[in-house]
């Protein structure tokens, strides 16, 4: 349905406040480097103008595009050029290009201060002088840190920030009722801008009918008594909103997931009976838990699924009218019998399924040729839960710390040319998949696992490809999305790298390393690790983890010392000669 | 684009072999079945067998099975048919043709005349 | 193996002239598939899955039929559709053609 003017339509859906904050969003995860004022000043105009559209639809510029009117409003910035180089080079075309040019420019990695936090006293009353600019610097600095960040579950995630300090500040022990909150909402928000960050590379790297079949192997498993023209027109509807987040197209995105959620409520009967408690929540917090809802019970007696896929005469007739349609069907069939899958799994059996029928419908003698084709499938379930039992069982024996480090070598010597903080980073979170996912029955570690570093490793993908480096990782992240973890799985040490020159500054340690938190003195230790491996590759785990456990005993050593600087200056020059010593460098 | 370009014509003594070849160009030659075709002179058109390069599999017509051998190269894309103990019978033109779903052949090579003659 | 009968071996027509061949299964076949062969060069596949007209066939073609019954229709006759055109069935091992119906211009 056209509205005359598109920026009325959405602001009237929308309402001022949760208009005004995604297009802070809109702007802020495009001109990352701007300062707050500036894009508050910005908000400001659009938000006024897009009054004057209420007011009167057939106003000057009214009728434009928000890509145009947005765009327009970017390139007023006046100091594009200086700021941002040739990214100013976007305001010179047109939309739909202009728009195109701004995505490419989005920067997963910009180069920003870390966010520190305040003492608790300094946050409280900044959030009672002026809560609406307290928000909104909140939603600011998350959004040009995490250019990808799902625009309305970071209205969410403000709302829950809201809440914490409206709580927390009257509370008689502030920083106690505070500190885990805000440490929660850390966690959960850098959790779901990997997520979403999967979800665009997915639908910008790999294309719409990638994004689909991803969206009916989850929903399928989701909402198994669901008919499939039910669970398909989710996906559709589903696609489009994630379409429009991930194109910058916040307001339509927010407003449609808004609509996504309404209907799914208005459905239930049809779709899952787990969906009660969510629909009885208002809309933020409803689309949050739709999204998080729990699997439904499996209908009883499905019927194999060998009848309709491999026994019936109308396989290749059924396949040849509507293979999208058919491959569809097959997804959604394996995925809502099969909630102990991953949904890359999922995938790669469609893939298998899909391949065998386009050479197998070919063939003189089709039902000879596809006959077995369940039994290609074997090979692809025990590959993923060997490998989670194997890792799970070294989590368990090892602890977090220790596997992550595991890891880290692992990956080191699979990839050795990758950026030093990438690799601690992303080695870091692929080892939070045992204290994630090993506590699982069975029945659900593959799902929690493989979907988590399919995740991670695309945050490896996307920090490399700003970057690249290695052609290996490029052939990992670009051939297939969904062999992704395998072929990272299956990559042995890379012979061809010429190891690093050793270079001592790598190993000096300072008595600061003693005032930092247990998380950021673990990050120091992996990133000396990693320089380790890099500097020798063919280093034995045994050779690794003594020169490891001497780092850890000279630190503590250190920390203790009366005289931390000298301890870490004597004692380091001889940790790294017998370092040298013991790794031949 | 797709062709299929089948090596030369053949006078062969009857009791020998003779190797025919397919050179495929254009299109993912792994992923479609090669056929093999039959067409005596003033005759219909008989089939002989199929491979899918991908894998190897084959498919043979039960007429020609010990008398045909078809087999593929990935590296040169290209498809054989060897043809074994030849008599007069086997004079024929003979052509490749690249199989796609549901059975039809889309391109076919241009033939190769096999004489069989002492 | 399935046998296909088609009919008439030769038929000629006139230009203008609607001509219709046909292709009997000797046992039900899934689809059906016709070729079009002048003298000195390959088959050239002509309709496809029963009824789909191969790229560059002119829109004057058309393919029908189900189970046993198939049949090629031209529904005005030019002086290039003159040849043979053959029938093969896809959908039992082995794969079998007809022995052509021969087309020619009256």
């Known amino acids: 349905d056209a509205h005359k003017s598109e920026v009325a339509h959405r602001f009237k859906d929308l309402g001022e406040e949760n208009f005004k904050a995604l297009v802070l969003i809109a702007f802020a995860q495009y001109l990352q480097q701007c300062p707050f004022e500036d894009h508050v000043k910005l908000v400001n105009e659009v938000t006024e103008f897009a009054k004057t559209c209420v007011a009167d639809e057939s106003a000057e510029n009214c009728d434009k595009s928000l890509h145009t009117l947005f765009g327009d409003k970017l390139c007023t910035v006046a100091t594009l050029r200086e700021t941002y180089g040739e990214m100013a080079d976007c305001c010179a075309k047109q939309e739909p290009e202009r728009n195109e040019c701004f995505l490419q420019h989005k920067d997963d990695n910009p180069n920003l201060p870390r966010l520190v936090r305040p003492e608790v006293d300094v946050m409280c009353t900044a959030f009672h002088d002026n809560e609406e600019t307290f928000l909104k610097k909140y939603l600011y600095e998350i959004a040009r840190r995490h250019p990808y960040f799902y625009a309305p579950e970071l209205l969410f995630f403000a709302k829950r920030y809201k809440a914490a300090f409206t709580e927390c500040c009257q509370a008689a022990d502030k920083a106690a009722c505070l500190l885990p909150k805000l440490d929660e909402l850390r966690d959960e928000g850098k959790a779901s801008s990997a997520k979403q960050r999967l979800k665009c590379a997915s639908l910008q790297k790999f294309g719409e009918r990638a994004f689909k079949a991803w969206a009916v192997a989850r929903l399928s498993q989701r909402f198994p008594k669901a008919e499939f023209a039910e669970v398909s027109k989710l996906v559709t509807d589903l696609t489009k909103v994630h379409t429009e987040c991930c194109h910058g197209d916040l307001l339509e995105c927010a407003d449609d997931r808004a609509d996504l959620a309404k209907y799914i409520c208005e459905n239930q009967d049809s779709i899952s009976s787990k969906l009660k408690e969510c629909c009885e929540k208002p809309l933020l917090e409803k689309s949050h838990c739709i999204a998080e809802v729990e699997n439904d019970e499996m209908p009883a007696d499905l019927p194999s699924l060998a009848a309709d896929f491999v026994e019936s005469k109308d396989v290749c007739k059924n396949y040849a009218e509507a293979k999208d349609v058919f491959l569809g069907m097959f997804l959604y069939e394996y995925a809502r019998r099969h909630p102990d899958y991953s949904v890359v799994l999922l995938l790669r059996l469609a893939k298998t399924y899909e391949t065998t029928l386009e050479k197998c419908c070919a063939a003189a003698d089709p039902h000879e040729c596809y006959a077995k084709v369940f039994d290609e499938f074997k090979p692809l379930v025990e590959e993923p839960q060997n490998l989670i039992k194997q890792n799970c069982e070294l989590f368990e024996q090892l602890g977090e710390y220790k596997f992550q480090n595991a890891l880290l070598v692992r990956y080191t010597k699979k990839v050795p040319q990758v950026s030093t903080p990438t690799l601690v980073e992303v080695s870091r979170n692929l080892g939070k998949v045992g204290s994630k996912c090993c506590k699982h029955p069975e029945a659900k570690r593959m799902p929690c696992a493989e979907d988590y570093l399919s995740v991670v490793l695309n945050q490896l993908c996307v920090l490399h490809e700003k970057t690249p480096v290695s052609d290996r990782v490029t052939k990992c992240c670009t051939e297939s999305l969904v062999n992704r973890r395998p072929c990272f799985s299956a990559l042995e040490v890379d012979e061809t790298y010429v190891p690093k020159e050793f270079n001592a500054e790598t190993f000096t340690f300072h008595a600061d390393i003693c005032t930092l938190s247990e998380k950021e003195r673990q990050i120091k230790k992996q990133t000396a690790l990693v320089e380790l491996v890099k500097h020798k590759p063919k280093a034995t785990k045994e050779q690794l983890k003594a020169v490891m456990d001497d780092f850890a005993a000279f630190v503590e050593k250190c920390c203790k010392a009366d005289d931390k600087e000298t301890c870490f200056a004597e004692e380091g020059k001889k940790l790294v000669a017998a370092s040298q010593a013991a790794l031949g460098l | 684009q797709v062709q299929l370009q089948q090596s030369g014509a053949e006078l062969v003594r009857p009791g020998s072999s003779v190797k025919i070849s397919c050179k495929a160009s254009?299109?993912?030659?792994?992923?479609?079945?090669m056929n093999w075709v039959k067409q005596r002179p003033g005759q219909g058109l008989e089939w002989i067998g199929q491979?899918?390069?991908?894998?190897?599999?084959?498919y043979y017509n039960g007429r020609f099975k010990g008398k045909a051998t078809i087999t593929a190269d990935k590296s040169p894309t290209t498809a054989y048919m060897q043809l074994s103990s030849l008599t007069s019978e086997d004079s024929a033109v003979y052509v490749c043709?690249?199989?796609?779903?549901?059975?039809?052949?889309?391109?076919w090579g241009q033939g190769t005349t096999l004489t069989v003659s002492s | 193996q399935i046998v296909l009968t088609q009919s008439p071996a030769i038929m000629s027509a006139s230009p203008g002239e609607k001509v219709t061949m046909t292709c009997s299964a000797s046992?039900?076949?899934?689809?059906m598939h016709w070729y079009q062969q002048k003298s000195g060069t390959s088959p050239k596949r002509w309709i496809y899955?029963?009824?789909k007209l191969a790229s560059g066939v002119p829109v004057r073609f058309s393919g029908s039929g189900s189970g046993t019954s198939y049949s090629l229709t031209i529904r005005s006759m030019e002086a290039e559709d003159a040849a043979t055109y053959y029938c093969?069935?896809?959908?039992?091992?082995?794969?079998?053609f007809g022995a052509g119906t021969k087309l020619e211009l009256k």
């Open positions: 254009g299109y993912a030659f792994s992923n479609y079945w």
């Open positions: 899955d029963t009824s």
């Open positions: 093969q069935q896809w959908g039992s091992n082995p794969l079998t």
């Open positions: 491979i899918y390069p991908g894998d190897g599999d084959t």
């Open positions: 046992s039900s076949v899934s689809y």
């Open positions: 043709a690249r199989g796609v779903l549901l059975g039809s052949f889309d391109y």
